[in-house]
Structure formats: structure tokens, C-alpha cells
């Protein structure tokens, strides 16, 4: 079998500060040096790119500086964590992955995590 | 309006050259990798190249490798075809085609046609 | 190099029938990576089915995706005027990319 299989959890709930971390694991066909992996967010039918990374194996994951997402990378596995999400935000985050170099080239694409975002209550009005 | 437009197609002589261009608008060009794929007249569709975001990695068919050069310029929102060498066999119309976020080709330009014949 | 094989080559269908298409796969293709393509002469394919069953974006509930491994289909529930044209299907799992040779679906 050709394909790449790419594993997360089914659901993960965010913290009361609106972070959210999941492992995303791919079972590498081949040595790949230069892989990318992104998290789209799937809303409906429509999919959006929430952030994206590439990196060298054994080298650390970089986002982009304004990017909502950090993550570390051990082997075939990428620790992320998204962070700044609202209520609104809950939704289906897939983790999608790409063996970019050497050839041949790969996509893995996983079956996506249910991200659970609940707003915090907002403190009431102290008397002190 | 998100679209691709091809250009360059024409008449060429075999062992000449040609380069294509595919302008894209409408979206973040350099967030998708990109294809060109051919169809010779009468047939199915060839895959040709990929290109990587950055345009770093590229990957070509086995029977244009070594002839044909894909580029990109993210700036410019552009995507490129050097095609040096060319055979008989190479004509057919070109599409630049982008990779959607989940793997297929959702976007496709009109298509330029290369001849060539002596 | 992943081989599809599309059968039949040509098929006849009278409008408001069904049509079911067939494309067989070298070696097992995971089935979020199999693709399907509807091109009418003189345009450029269109995409229709991605991951084998889901619908691109408007395209209209009677085409269908399904299977797995190295077999899947296309199904044209009921077939409207405008849907006769060539459907190629297309493994984008792995390098190099690959399309079947294509189906034409004609008037009977």
C-alpha cells in the first residue's frame, strides 16, 4: 500500500484559556527529510488552512511568528498545540502531512480532531 | 474570482523550446502546491509536474524528466514550464491545475495548446 | 508507479438512467486519496469526487463515490443532458500522480 497513514485523537477539549494540544503521528513509507504538516480546520464542507509548518527531521518545528500554532516533532510524530481559540473556534481540526523530500512524494491525511472550545465564565463583579 | 490563466502555448519546431506561464489570482498562491498536466489530442489526461509551495521540491513525469523545468514565482503569483527538447509526442494542451488543501485538483486553468511539428 | 485502470472504456446510457463507472488501482490506494474528474470537450476536467466519496464543491447529489483499497466507483444516479462527458479517476496519495485512461459516457 502506497498511502500514508496519519493518526490523531478523535477528540480533545481545550483548556479554560483556549489551548488545545494533540499528537499527530504518521506511519512514513519511506526516510523522509523534509516534512510538512498543516492543520485545516473543517467547517461543513469547507475547509480552511489554520496553520501550517515545514521541517527537517531532527529539527524543531517552526510556524510562522503570527501563527496561532506551536509544535514540537519527535521522529514520526508532532506535538501541536493551537492556541487563542473562542467558543466559535470548536470545530473538526484535521492534521494533513507531506513527505516533501526525498522522492517519492507522500500526503497523509488524517481523519481530523473534534476540538472542543468552551468559553470561560466571565468573573462576577466583586464587592471588595 | 479565483482562477488560473494559462500562456505561451504556440507552434514549435522539434528540439525547440517554449515556456509557459499560469497566472493565478483570487487566492494565497504560495499557501498550494501546483501541476501542470497535459492532454495529447484525442487522449487522456498526463500528469507532468508538482511543485512545492516554496518551490523548493519538484517532481517531474518520467517522460519529460530531465527536458522540462517548473518554476514558481510567489511574488509574482506566477507558475512556469521550461520546456527544452521538444518531441512530437510533447503536444498537447497544458493545464496548470492547483492542489486543493485536502490532496485533489480543485482549480484548473483553460489550457494552452503546444504543437510540435517541423 | 500506481496504475489505474478505468472500465468500460465507452458507455451508452440513455438519459434519466443510471451509470456506474469502474476504476481499479495497481495496489491499494487509501481511499482519502482517490479522486474522480468530469471533462466535456474543449474544457478542462472538473473536479467531482475527492477522498472517493465526498462532492466537490456544487456538485449535484447525484454523483456518488465509494470503495476502498483498489476498487472504487463512480454512480450517476440519474444521468441529466449535461452530464455526458469523459470521467477520469486519479490516485494523489503518492508520487507520480496518476489518471486513469478515462470513461466516455455517451447518448444510447
Known amino acids: 500500500c502506497k498511502a500514508m497513514h496519519v493518526a490523531q485523537p478523535a477528540v480533545v477539549l481545550a483548556s479554560s484559556r483556549g489551548i488545545a494540544s494533540f499528537v499527530c503521528e504518521y506511519a512514513s513509507p519511506g526516510k523522509a527529510t523534509e516534512v510538512r504538516v498543516t492543520v485545516l480546520r473543517q467547517a461543513d464542507s469547507q475547509v480552511t488552512e489554520v496553520c501550517a509548518a515545514t521541517y527537517m527531521m531532527g529539527n524543531e518545528l517552526t510556524f510562522l511568528d503570527d501563527s496561532i500554532c506551536t509544535g514540537t516533532s519527535s521522529g514520526n510524530q508532532v506535538n501541536l498545540t493551537i492556541q487563542g481559540l473562542r467558543a466559535m473556534d470548536t470545530g473538526l481540526y484535521i492534521c494533513k502531512v507531506e513527505l516533501m523530500y526525498p522522492p517519492p512524494y507522500y500526503l497523509g491525511i488524517g481523519n481530523g480532531t473534534q476540538i472542543y472550545v468552551i468559553d470561560p465564565e466571565p468573573c462576577p463583579d466583586s464587592d471588595f | 474570482e479565483v482562477q488560473l490563466v494559462e500562456s505561451g502555448g504556440g507552434l514549435v519546431k522539434p528540439g525547440g523550446s517554449l515556456r509557459l506561464s499560469c497566472a493565478a489570482s483570487?487566492?494565497?498562491?504560495?499557501?498550494?502546491?501546483m501541476h501542470w498536466v497535459r492532454q495529447a489530442p484525442g487522449k487522456g489526461l498526463e500528469w507532468v509536474s508538482f511543485?512545492?509551495?516554496?518551490?523548493?521540491?519538484?517532481y517531474y513525469a518520467d517522460s519529460v524528466k530531465g527536458r522540462f523545468t517548473i518554476s514558481r514565482d510567489n511574488a509574482k503569483n506566477s507558475l512556469y514550464l521550461q520546456m527544452n527538447s521538444l518531441r512530437a509526442e510533447d503536444t498537447a494542451v497544458y493545464y496548470c491545475?492547483?492542489?486543493?488543501?485536502?490532496?485533489?485538483?480543485?482549480?484548473w486553468g483553460q489550457g494552452t495548446m503546444v504543437t510540435v511539428s517541423s | 508507479e500506481i496504475v489505474l485502470t478505468q472500465s468500460p472504456g465507452t458507455l451508452s446510457v440513455s438519459p434519466g438512467e443510471r451509470a456506474t463507472l469502474s476504476c481499479r488501482a495497481s495496489?491499494?490506494?487509501?481511499?482519502?486519496?482517490l479522486a474522480w474528474y468530469q471533462q466535456k470537450p474543449g474544457q478542462a476536467p472538473r473536479l467531482l469526487i475527492y477522498?472517493?466519496?465526498s462532492r466537490a464543491t456544487g456538485i449535484p447529489d447525484r454523483f456518488s463515490g465509494s470503495g476502498s483499497g483498489t476498487d472504487f466507483t463512480l454512480t450517476i444516479s440519474r444521468l441529466e443532458p449535461e452530464d455526458f462527458a469523459v470521467y477520469y479517476c486519479?490516485?494523489?496519495?503518492?508520487?507520480?500522480?496518476?489518471f486513469g485512461q478515462g470513461t466516455k459516457v455517451e447518448i444510447k
Open positions: 483570487g487566492f494565497t498562491f504560495s499557501s498550494y502546491t
Open positions: 495496489q491499494s490506494v487509501g481511499s482519502s486519496y
Open positions: 511543485i512545492s509551495y516554496d518551490g523548493n521540491q519538484k
Open positions: 477522498g472517493a466519496f
Open positions: 491545475a492547483r492542489t486543493s488543501l485536502l490532496g485533489p485538483f480543485d482549480l
Open positions: 486519479q490516485q494523489y496519495g503518492s508520487s507520480p500522480w496518476t
